[in-house]
C-alpha cells in the first residue's frame, strides 16, 4: 500500500532555514526574500514506528531527489547524513530504522528524534551557516525545536 507523504519546509526555533551544503549535507542559516527559494523542500512520509497522540514516525526525504536523512554510527557516534536510495523502492511504509524519526509535537514546536538512536535529535547550532546534525542533548545551546511549513505539491 502506498505511503502517505506531504511536502514541507522546516525552520528552527530561531527561524533559520535549511539549505543544501554540498551534495550530502544540510546547513541552517537565515534567509530572506528571494533567497527563501534556496531552502530545501522535504517530502515527509508517514512510516512504521512508535505512534501516539503527540508522536508520529516519519521519514524525511528531499523532494524529487533520491536522498533521505538517515542516522548511522560514525566513529561510535550517532551521526546525521543524507543517504542516497533507489527511487524505485522509496518511500515505503516500512522504512529501515535509520531513516525513521519520531516527530514529536510540544507547544506548537516540533522535535525530530532518531528512532535508531533514542534521545538523539535533529539539531542546528546557534551559529549561522553550520551543518544540521544529530545532537544528544535537548534544552542546551543547540537547537532541537522546529516549525513546519506546508508546501503545495
Amino acid at each position: 500500500a502506498p505511503v502517505r507523504s506531504l511536502n514541507c519546509t522546516l525552520r528552527d526555533s530561531q527561524q533559520k532555514s535549511l539549505v543544501m551544503s554540498g551534495p550530502y549535507e544540510l546547513k541552517a542559516l537565515h534567509l530572506q526574500g528571494q533567497d527563501m527559494e534556496q531552502q530545501v523542500v522535504f517530502s515527509m512520509s508517514f512510516v512504521q514506528g512508535e505512534e501516539s497522540n503527540d508522536k508520529i514516525p516519519v521519514a524525511l526525504g528531499l523532494k524529487e531527489k533520491n536522498l533521505y536523512l538517515s542516522c548511522v554510527l560514525k566513529d561510535d557516534k550517532p551521526t546525521l547524513q543524507l543517504e542516497s536510495v533507489d527511487p524505485k523502492n522509496y518511500p515505503k511504509k516500512k522504512m529501515e530504522k535509520r531513516f525513521v524519526f519520531n516527530k514529536i509535537e510540544i507547544n506548537n514546536k516540533l522535535e525530530f528524534e532518531s528512532a535508531q538512536f533514542p534521545n538523539w535529535y535533529i539539531s542546528t547550532s546557534q551559529a549561522e551557516n553550520m551543518p544540521v546534525f544529530l545532537g544528544g542533548t535537548k534544552g542546551g545551546q543547540d537547537i532541537t525545536d522546529f516549525t513546519m511549513q506546508f508546501v503545495s505539491s
Epitope: A1, Q48, G49, E50, K93, K94, E96, K97, R98, Q116
Partner: antibody
Framework: QVQLQQWGAGLLKPSETLSLTCAVY????????WSWIRQPPGKGLEWIGE???????NYNPSLKSRVTISVDTSRNQFSLSLSSVTAADTAVYYC?????????????WGQGTLVTVSS | QSVLTQPPSVSVSPGQTASITCSGD??????AFWYQQKPGQSPVLVIY???KRPSGIPERFSGSNSGNTATLTISGTQALDEADYYC?????????FGGGTKLTVLG
Amino acid sequence: QVQLQQWGAGLLKPSETLSLTCAVYGGSFSDYYWSWIRQPPGKGLEWIGEIDHSGSTNYNPSLKSRVTISVDTSRNQFSLSLSSVTAADTAVYYCARASPSSGWTLDYWGQGTLVTVSS
Amino acid sequence: QSVLTQPPSVSVSPGQTASITCSGDKLGDKFAFWYQQKPGQSPVLVIYLDNKRPSGIPERFSGSNSGNTATLTISGTQALDEADYYCYAWDNAYEVFGGGTKLTVLG
C-alpha cells in the same frame, strides 16, 4: 473492545478457490491495515497479505499470483480469495488487524478457520 | 525457507531467564516483533518495535534488536509462559515470520 470474526468454507477439493471473510466489530475500520495469515498444521505462521480501507494491497510474493484480498468498508469486512488450492494450502487461516499504535503490526487476531484441501 | 531464523526449541527451569533469538540479514535495521502462541489459540503480540510491551503483557517480557539478531527475553519464567514464540519483521515490503521456537518450562 475490538473483535474479528471470520468464516468461510472449511473443506475444499484441489483446484477450487478458497474464500474467507472477516468482520470487524468495535473500533474504526479506516485507521488500520487488515491482514491474512495462515498456519499449516503443526507448522509456523505465514503472512499472506494486507489491505487498507481504500483497497490498496500488499501480498506475499510466493502467493501473489493466486491471492486476492478485498474490502467492503460499508460492512466493516474484508475477504481473502486463494485460487487453485492444493493440499499444501491446508492450514488454519487467521485474519488480523495492523495498528499504528503498535508500529503497524498485528495486534488483534481472529479466532482462525481451519481449511482442509482434500480430494 | 524463512528469512528469519529461530532455534526450534528452548528449555528453561521455572524462575530462570529464557532467551529466544531471531536472526536475519541486517535485522537490527528493521523493527522486530514477537508473538506468543499457545496450542489451539491465536497468536498474541508480546513485544513490538523491538522492545515495547503491549498493555497487559507482564514486565518479565523484554526485547532487544541489533546487528543481525533480535532477542526475546523472559525473566523469571513461569509455567504459563510455555508456548511457541514467533519473531516477525518485514523484508522487501512484505511481512516475514520466523520459523518459531517452542519454549519448554521444565519441571
